[in-house]
C-alpha cells in the first residue's frame, strides 16, 4: 500500500504522458487522477513504465473500480494485464472478442498463466458455449487449448465449432477428450463426401468406435500408420485382418515396424496366424491354427 501524500506543486498530471516515467511511486499515487488514467489507458502501453510504476497505476484502477474494471478499460490494459491476478480477473465481465484478442496478444509467447486461464474461463462462461470464433481465437494463440479442457467442458462445444479445429490443436488430447470430440466432428462433417470427410475426421479418430472404423475400411481411405496408432485399442481389436488391410491400404506394410506397440500388438494377438500370414509381412503372435477362440467378454455378457 502506497501511503497517501500530497502531490507536489506543479506535478499534478493533466494527461497520461511520458513525463510520468520520472515520477517516483508516491508521486504517481498522489498526482495521477484515477479517472484520468481510466480514460487514457490506451496511452499507458506506449510509455516505458517500470513494473513498480505499473503497480501504482493498477492500485489506482483498483481503487476506482473495486467491483471490477469496465470493458472499456480492460481492452486497453496492455502490459498492465500481466499485473492482474486471477482474483482481479474474476471480477471482470469480458464479452467482446476484440478485448479477449487484445489481452491474449499482450500475453503472446508467455506460458499459459493462471491469469489467462481465468480470463478465458470468464469469457467462455459469459458466452455460454465455446463458439467457433472464440475457438478460432483461442487455438490461434494456444494450439493446445482444446486439450487443456476437461471432457465435461468439451461437451459444451457445439459441433459447428469443430470446423475451427486444426490437427495440431488435438496433438495433446487424451482418449477421453477425443471420445467427446469425435461424435461432434462426425456430426459437423457428415455432409462431406468420402475423401474430404476422411481428411477432416482423421485427427479425431482417436475417439472412433469399431463400427465407424469398419465403415471407413470400405471407403479406400488409406489411413496412415500414425493415425492408426492413435486409435482406441478397444476399437481396433474387433477389426479383421481384411478390414485393417482395407483401412490402411498401401500403408499396411507399416504394421511390421509397429508390431510390438499398442494397438498393433494387441490386435495381432487376437488374429488367426493364418489370416496374418495373408498379409505377407511376417507378423507373428497370432492364434495358431486349430485353436478355438472363445470370446469371454461375450460369454460374461450372456451369463
Amino acid at each position: 500500500e502506497v501511503e497517501k501524500t500530497a502531490c507536489p506543486s506543479g506535478k499534478k498530471a493533466r494527461e497520461i504522458d511520458e513525463s510520468l516515467i520520472f515520477y517516483k511511486k508516491w508521486e504517481l499515487e498522489a498526482c495521477v487522477d484515477a479517472a484520468l488514467l481510466a480514460t487514457q489507458m490506451d496511452r499507458v502501453n506506449a510509455i516505458p513504465f517500470t513494473y513498480e510504476q505499473l503497480d501504482v497505476l493498477k492500485h489506482k484502477l483498483d481503487e476506482l473500480y473495486p467491483q471490477g474494471y469496465p470493458e472499456s478499460v480492460i481492452q486497453h490494459l496492455g502490459y498492465l494485464f500481466l499485473k492482474m491476478s486471477p482474483e482481479d480477473i474474476r471480477k471482470w465481465n469480458v464479452t467482446s472478442l476484440e478485448t479477449l484478442k487484445a489481452l491474449l496478444e499482450v500475453n503472446k509467447g508467455h506460458e499459459m498463466s493462471p491469469q489467462v486461464a481465468t480470463l478465458i474461463d470468464r469469457f467462455v462462461k459469459g458466452r455460454g458455449q465455446l463458439d467457433k470464433d472464440t475457438l478460432d481465437t483461442l487455438t490461434a494463440f494456444y494450439p493446445g487449448y482444446l486439450c487443456s479442457l476437461s471432457p465435461e467442458e468439451l461437451s459444451s462445444v457445439p459441433p459447428s465449432s469443430i470446423w475451427a479445429v486444426r490437427p495440431q490443436d488435438l496433438d495433446t488430447c487424451d482418449p477421453r477428450q477425443l471420445d467427446v470430440l469425435y461424435p461432434k466432428a462426425r456430426l459437423a462433417f457428415q455432409n462431406m463426401n468420402g475423401s474430404e470427410y476422411f481428411v477432416k475426421i482423421q485427427s479425431f479418430l482417436g475417439g472412433a468406435p469399431t463400427e465407424d472404423l469398419k465403415a471407413l475400411s470400405q471407403q479406400n481411405v488409406s489411413m496412415d500408420l500414425a493415425t492408426f496408432m492413435k486409435l482406441r485399442t478397444d476399437a481396433v481389436l474387433p477389426l479383421t485382418v481384411a478390414e485393417v488391410q482395407k483401412l490402411l491400404g498401401p500403408h499396411v506394410e507399416g504394421l511390421k515396424a509397429e508390431e510390438r506397440h499398442r494397438p498393433v500388438r494387441d490386435w495381432i494377438l487376437r488374429q488367426r496366424q493364418d489370416d496374418l500370414d495373408t498379409l505377407g509381412l511376417g507378423l507373428q503372435g497370432g492364434i495358431p491354427n486349430g485353436y478355438l477362440v472363445l470370446d469371454l467378454s461375450m460369454q460374461e455378457a450372456l451369463s
Epitope: I47, P48, E52, K108, S113, Q115
Partner: antibody, heavy 117, light 107 residues
Framework: QVQLVESGGGLVKPGGSLRLSCAAS????????MTWIRQAPGKGLEWISY????????YYADSVKGRFTISRDNAKNSLYLQMNSLRAEDTAVYYC??????????WGQGTLVTVSS | DIQMTQSPSSVSASVGDRVTITCRAS??????LAWYQQKPGKAPKLLIY???VLQSGVPSRFSGSGSGTDFTLTISSLQPEDFATYYC?????????FGQGTKVEIK
C-alpha cells in the same frame, strides 16, 4: 548494495542437463521480476526468459522454449534456470538480471556454460 | 520479433571526442529503449533507459535521444574508461531484443 551471483555453469555433453542458480541480495527479491540473458562467446546478448515477482507469469524465447525452465524461490532469494536437452549453440555466459520492464538495472557477473562432446 | 540494428558496428575515437551510436528498430517502439555498456569479461551495465533517462550513478557525458524507430546514444567527451562495447535493447514487446553491439576502440 544490490548483488546477483550466478552459479552452476560448467561443461556438459550435448543432450545433457544443467541447473543454474542466481543468489540475490541487497534488495527485496520478492518484489522484483527477474530475467536470464545469455551471451555466446564473442557474440551479442540474447534475452531468454523472465519470471514475475510471484512466479505466475513466465516467458521463454523460442530458442529455449520446451527445454529450459525458469523458477524462483522467494524465501531463499534465489532464481533458477533448469536447462535440459542442451545443444552446442547453448554455449554461452549466462547472466541473471533484475528486470524493471523498461530495462535491466542490475546484472550478475555471469556463469559459463559449455556444451561439447 | 523486433529487430534492433546498431551502427556503426565499431568506431575508433580518441579521448575527448564526441561519439554517436545509432540504433534502429524494425518497427515503432515509442521510447521503450535502453542502452548498456559492456567491458571485456564483465557483465553489461545499464546507462540509459526509456530512451533518454540517465541511470543513477552514470556520468552526465552519456545521453540518449530518439523515439519511434530511431535512437541515439551520445558520449559528449570520451574518457579512457568509456572504451567498451555498447548495446541497445527494446522492451516494447516480447521477446526483448538487443542490437548487435557497437565497439568503441582507441584510435
Amino acid at each position: 548494495q544490490v548483488q546477483l551471483v550466478e552459479s552452476g555453469g560448467g561443461l556438459v555433453k550435448p543432450g545433457g542437463s544443467l541447473r543454474l542458480s542466481c543468489a540475490a541480495s541487497g534488495f527485496t527479491f520478492s518484489d522484483y521480476y527477474m530475467t536470464w540473458i545469455r551471451q555466446a562467446p564473442g557474440k551479442g546478448l540474447e534475452w531468454i526468459s523472465y519470471i514475475s515477482s510471484s512466479g505466475s507469469t513466465i516467458y521463454y524465447a523460442d530458442s529455449v522454449k520446451g527445454r529450459f525452465t525458469i523458477s524462483r524461490d522467494n524465501a531463499k532469494n534465489s532464481l533458477y534456470l533448469q536447462m535440459n536437452s542442451l545443444r552446442a549453440e547453448d554455449t554461452a555466459v549466462y547472466y541473471c538480471a533484475r528486470d524493471r520492464n523498461s530495462h535491466f538495472d542490475y546484472w550478475g557477473q555471469g556463469t559459463l556454460v559449455t556444451v561439447s562432446s | 520479433d523486433i529487430q534492433m540494428t546498431q551502427s556503426p558496428s565499431s568506431v575508433s575515437a580518441s579521448v575527448g571526442d564526441r561519439v554517436t551510436i545509432t540504433c534502429r528498430a524494425s518497427q515503432g517502439i515509442t521510447r521503450w529503449l535502453a542502452w548498456y555498456q559492456q567491458k571485456p569479461g564483465k557483465a553489461p551495465k545499464l546507462l540509459i533507459y526509456a530512451a533518454s533517462v540517465l541511470q543513477s550513478g552514470v556520468p552526465s557525458r552519456f545521453s540518449g535521444s530518439g523515439s519511434g524507430t530511431d535512437f541515439t546514444l551520445t558520449i559528449s567527451s570520451l574518457q579512457p574508461e568509456d572504451f567498451a562495447t555498447y548495446y541497445c535493447q527494446q522492451s516494447n514487446s516480447f521477446p526483448r531484443t538487443f542490437g548487435q553491439g557497437t565497439k568503441v576502440e582507441i584510435k
